[in-house]
Amino acid sequence: ESALITQQDLAPQQRAAPQQKRSSPSEGLCPPGHHISEDGRDCISCKYGQDYSTHWNDLLFCLRCTRCDSGEVELSPCTTTRNTVCQCEEGTFREEDSPEMCRKCRTGCPRGMVKVGDCTPWSDIECVHKESGTKHSGEVPAVEETVTSSPGTPASPCSLSG
């Protein structure tokens, strides 16, 4: 199952179930862990372990919690105010600016280079030239992850209204 949020993954715009806590918006916004009701009068709590909101908002939905992909480990579970934190398994890494997937770390350095940094969940091994000490950027090109959009929820007539 994809860990990416598409429109289909948003919690539906529905009246709060009886067990969902309600409070009043403050200056039109609801606190983290809540979303606003359709009439704008109530803040409805997100469902623990299912969806979340991390910031003050007037969203009509909470966001679906991420499920860690295979090849990832869960560092911390999803709460009503924070999404799941996933980390690449040992021997794989995901760079800060690379697509959202874990890539295998290289097992060794090219000829004429020495390893100066280990594989971590966020970086490949680091190699430098024996003589010059200059870094080697690594030959493995970033793998693109293709995400196609799904039809999702029908468009709201007054989105991001301004």
Epitope: L4, Q7, L59, T66
Partner: nanobody, 124 residues
């Protein structure tokens, strides 16, 4: 992939207002997750505001809550960030980001399309 171009930055006095624009081209934005991030000198990119193009509502960082508002104009394919009561600590390069799907809406890594940024300087 969508192309984004920000504008509207500049020098403003504390307490003043600015409206940033993010013009999108390349494809329709229906269903897109849209966010504003900012980057102050020597710091990482910080989440500012989030919304979905064709759904109501937005989320705001604590630091801008009640002062900044995200909006959009369908006919112009443009996202806006209205910034009021500006403070010196709002000084940064502001970036617009978009993605058809996101993993964590407040994480810069979740977005695959970025504008080049527009500089906002708040100073007297």
């Amino acid at each position: 992939e969508v192309q984004l171009l920000e504008s509207g930055g500049g020098l403003v006095q504390p307490g003043g207002s600015l409206r940033l624009s993010c013009a999108a081209s390349g494809r329709a934005l229906t269903g897109y997750h849209m966010s504003w991030f900012r980057q102050a000198p020597g710091k990482g990119r910080e989440f500012v505001s989030y919304g979905i193009w064709d759904r109501a509502g937005a989320a705001y960082a604590d630091s801008v809550k009640g002062r900044f508002t995200i909006s959009r104009d369908n006919s112009k394919n443009t996202l806006y960030l209205q910034m009021n009561s500006l403070r010196a600590e709002d000084t940064a390069v502001y970036y617009c980001a978009a993605s058809m799907a996101v993993r964590t809406y407040y994480s810069p890594r979740s977005y695959d399309s970025w504008g080049q940024g527009t500089l906002v300087t708040v100073s007297s």
